[in-house]
């Protein structure tokens, strides 16, 4: 029977800069029941606080709700593991909410084949930003990436769409069924998961771009 091994805070993520969650990996338990607590203070302050919510983020997590989240301050946090034989502490982690944003996937993806009479046909892809993100405040710039491939193909074709919420693709294989998805990321932060997908059948008379 031993003191617990050193835990590690391995990830912090925020869906929208308004809340965030951090997760830790326990060390060895030393063969005894082990309690974990996360404590933090804000840079420039000495007052230590305990994690406000161990439930929302699931096992081995700490969730910071709106009232505990500040964009303009760095959080310095550590996890304490304690059993009957002693304690161990994780390394301190410095967290700036601005840099840990991972949005939810974009919504409302829809894809249509457009065949104007006077121009080349194209694939028109449209989507909406995730609902948790308020782009009107100007705090956020979301960038989008599209991936598509013929249904049976192994390789995805990637297109960067910038800040647009719609995109045109001209070069496609006639007669193929394509799978299309979109994801987003803030200017600082992480890519979202890929959105739910859309299958689209490209007509046989779709003319490839020159």
């Amino acid at each position: 029977q031993l003191p617990p091994g050193k835990p590690e805070i391995f990830k912090c993520r925020s869906p929208n800069k308004e809340t965030f969650t951090c997760w830790w990996r326990p060390g060895t338990d030393g063969g005894l029941p082990t309690n974990y607590s996360l404590t933090y203070h804000r840079e420039g302050e000495t007052l230590m606080h305990e994690c406000p919510d161990y439930i929302t983020g699931g096992p081995n997590s700490c969730h910071f709700g709106k009232q505990y989240t500040s964009m303009w301050r760095t959080y310095i946090m550590m996890v304490n593991a304690t059993n009957q034989m002693g304690s161990s502490f994780s390394d301190e982690l410095y967290v700036d909410v601005t840099y840990i944003v991972q949005p939810d996937p974009p919504l409302e993806l829809a894809v249509e084949v457009k065949q104007p009479e006077d121009r080349k046909p194209y694939l028109w892809i449209k989507w909406s930003p995730p609902t948790l993100i308020d782009l009107k405040t100007g705090w956020f710039t979301l960038l989008y990436e599209i991936r598509l491939k013929p249904e049976k193909a192994a390789e995805w074709e990637i297109h960067f769409a910038g800040q647009q919420t719609e995109f045109k693709i001209l070069s496609l294989h006639p007669g193929q069924k394509y799978l299309v998805q979109v994801r987003c990321k803030p200017d600082h932060g992480y890519w979202s998961a890929w959105s739910p997908a859309t299958f689209i059948q490209i007509p046989s008379d779709f003319t490839m771009n020159d």
């Epitope: 939810d104 409302e108 829809a110 909406s128 609902t131 998961a193």
Partner: antibody
Framework: QVTLKESGPVLVKPTQTLSLTCTVS??????????VSWIRQPPGKALEWLAH???????SYSTSLKSRLTISKDTSKRQVVLTMTNMDPVDTATYYC??????????????WGQGTLVTVSS | DIQMTQSPSSLSASVGDRVTITCRAS??????LNWYQQKPGKAPKLLLY???SLQSGVPSRFSGSGSGTDFTLTISSLQPEDFASYYC?????????FGQGTKVEIK
């Protein structure tokens, strides 16, 4: 209180075009993360998804029926219209409209209309 | 398009029984799987979404599990009002597809 109500003809002749209207209340067709879907169910058979339209006006259609279907919406009238061309007796079914909720890792039909039975017969 | 296969197509059970219905997708759909209940002459009603999230107002005897391609709807203790047809539906990729349904009948 969210409600959806389908309206349209109960009887159409083969080769004719069916036009169904879904009138909604309790939410707006322009609300982010909202949409309306059409689903049908032939007597004694399973549900079949036909089409949907999202708040951003994005549309999707059933692969097998795409060439016959058009979905559109009039946000101010709170209506979504589905048209289906070249009707055939096998299209006899109860046609439902339902609200789509899209959100954080979720996409589902949470409110349904009561359905309207459309019979295709000469 | 993704195919959804439900089993069994029908089952007979008694009040108080534990009932399990399975749904299999022809390819991975993450957790974008919804379950609906339909009674004769009525519109379907949402029970669960995103595989395991219980819709507001639905009794807790209904539960869902699974991700990827294999999903389960469980009714822990069947009640008289639960005799109905149940449908799974994937919303991972359009065109969306429903399972062919499972009819739960009184034994």
């Amino acid at each position: 209180q969210v409600t959806l109500k389908e309206s349209g003809p109960v009887l159409v002749k083969p080769t004719q075009t069916l036009s169904l209207t879904c009138t909604v209340s309790g939410f707006s067709l322009s609300d982010a993360g909202m949409g309306v879907s059409w689903i049908r169910q032939p007597p004694g058979k399973a549900l079949e998804w036909l089409a949907h339209i999202f708040s951003n006006d994005g549309k999707s259609y059933s692969t097998s029926l795409k060439s016959r279907l058009t979905i559109s919406k009039d946000t101010s009238k709170r209506q979504v219209v589905l048209t289906m061309t070249n009707m055939d007796p096998v299209d006899t079914a109860t046609y439902y409209c339902a609200r789509i909720r899209t959100g954080t890792y979720s996409l589902y039909l949470d409110y349904w209309g009561q359905g309207t039975l459309v019979t295709v017969s000469s | 398009d993704i195919q959804m296969t439900q089993s069994p197509s029908s089952l007979s059970a008694s009040v108080g029984d534990r009932v399990t219905i399975t749904c299999r997708a022809s390819q991975s759909i993450n957790s974008y799987l919804n379950w609906y209940q339909q009674k004769p002459g009525k519109a379907p009603k949402l029970l669960l979404y995103f595989a395991s999230s219980l819709q507001s107002g639905v009794p807790s005897r209904f539960s869902g599990s699974g991700s990827g391609t294999d999903f389960t709807l469980t009714i822990s203790s069947l009640q008289p009002e639960d005799f109905a047809s149940y449908y799974c539906q994937e919303s991972y990729s359009t065109p969306w597809t429903f399972g062919q349904g499972t009819k739960v009948e009184i034994k």
